[in-house]
């Protein structure tokens, strides 16, 4: 979800934004800081064993509006928050996993990973 009330049509920032990155640092990052023309993000999702894993990093402007919208994915507990208001703003983002639905218990521990939703570096 967006934290700073931006319009849905992404427009180019006049300047580069620096974000903290963790588990999601591109090659051009330095000291766990990445650079982007889009958004900083923090995401929490369950790994294959059901353990919550937090990742953070940069989303390029192109496609980031869709990714930051955090549309629910069947059989996957995941939440993402995005921000642009200052450098490393994602240090202060703390998304939480959505609550378990009854269906999730019935379906068992099979989680369909949809990595293309958040590995969007061009």
């Amino acid at each position: 979800k967006k934290e700073d009330g931006e319009s849905t049509a992404p427009t180019a920032r006049p300047k580069v934004l620096r974000c903290k990155c963790h588990h999601h640092c591109p090659e051009d990052s330095v000291n766990n800081i990445c650079s982007t023309d889009g958004y900083c993000f923090t995401m929490i999702e369950e790994d294959d064993s059901g353990t919550p894993v937090v990742t953070s990093g940069c989303l390029g402007l192109e496609g980031s509006d869709f990714q930051c919208r955090d549309t629910p994915i069947p059989h996957q507990r995941r939440s993402i928050e995005c921000c642009t208001e200052r450098n490393e703003c994602n240090k202060d983002l703390h998304p939480t996993l959505p609550p378990l639905k009854d269906r999730d218990f019935v379906d068992g521990p099979i989680h369909h990973k949809h990595h293309h939703h958040h590995h969007h570096h061009h």
Epitope: D28, S29, S35, G60, L61, E62, R86, H122
Partner: antibody
């Protein structure tokens, strides 16, 4: 039009510190980073670091950490670079430059001479 | 740090000639956003550098169309189709993909 005004020259003694200034006009100061670049004769251009005036976030070239400190005064749209423990190696032209994703405007540069 | 290697160091030309300057980087300048942050500047004697080309091939406002940039990855070229007297000076390439940002050592364009 975009202008970055820097004093033309400064003469300082070895071992002292100096604070170079760069006054920006013609644009919204907080909408762009300000970079500082060193140029010594025959040694090309060296990136010192940058500061985002909107949140005073800084990034430095490791080579200049401990040597340069970048600050801003948003009320006067002025960027500053303090250089400490000066030696003859610090004698150079220092440019401030506006940066978004690339430097598009440069100041005229301050020629710093470190001499006793 | 990314090393930017410019060739030639000196480029003697006659007015009206085409000039070509090469810039090679020690690693790819394609940023994780997909942009390539390679830029060209001209520094005339006693002046500060001026932006000519940004992001490989985009001419900055007011820059004549005789200047063009091309390339990708690690290999970039600046071309001046017909050199004029006002084009003389030192040309630098620069990258802002990787911190610390780095510059080429410069190519001096001079009259033959």
């Amino acid at each position: 039009q975009v202008q970055l005004q820097q004093p033309g020259a400064d003469l300082v003694k070895p071992g002292t510190s100096v604070k170079l200034s760069c006054k920006a006009s013609g644009y919204t100061f907080t909408s762009y980073w300000m970079q500082w670049v060193k140029q010594r004769p025959g040694q090309g251009l060296e990136w010192i670091g940058e500061i985002d005036p909107s949140d005073t976030y800084t990034m430095y070239n490791q080579k200049f950490k401990g040597k340069a400190t970048l600050t801003v005064d948003t009320s006067s749209s002025t960027a500053y670079m303090q250089l400490s423990s000066l030696t003859s190696e610090d004698s150079a032209v220092y440019y401030c430059a506006r940066f978004g994703y690339y430097v598009d405007y440069w100041g005229q540069g301050t020629t710093l001479t470190v001499s006793s | 740090d990314v090393v930017m290697t410019q060739t030639p160091l000196s480029l003697p030309v006659s007015l009206g000639d085409q000039a070509s300057i090469s810039c090679r980087s020690s690693q790819s300048l394609v940023h994780s956003t997909g942009n390539t942050y390679l830029h060209w500047y001209l520094q005339k004697a006693g002046q500060s550098p001026k932006l000519l080309i940004y992001k490989v091939s985009n001419r900055f406002s007011g820059v004549p169309d005789r200047f063009s940039g091309s390339g990708s990855g690690t290999d970039f070229t600046l071309k001046i189709s017909r050199v004029e007297a006002e084009d003389l000076g030192v040309y630098f390439c620069s990258q802002s993909t990787h911190v610390p940002f780095t510059f080429g050592s410069g190519t001096k364009l001079e009259i033959k």
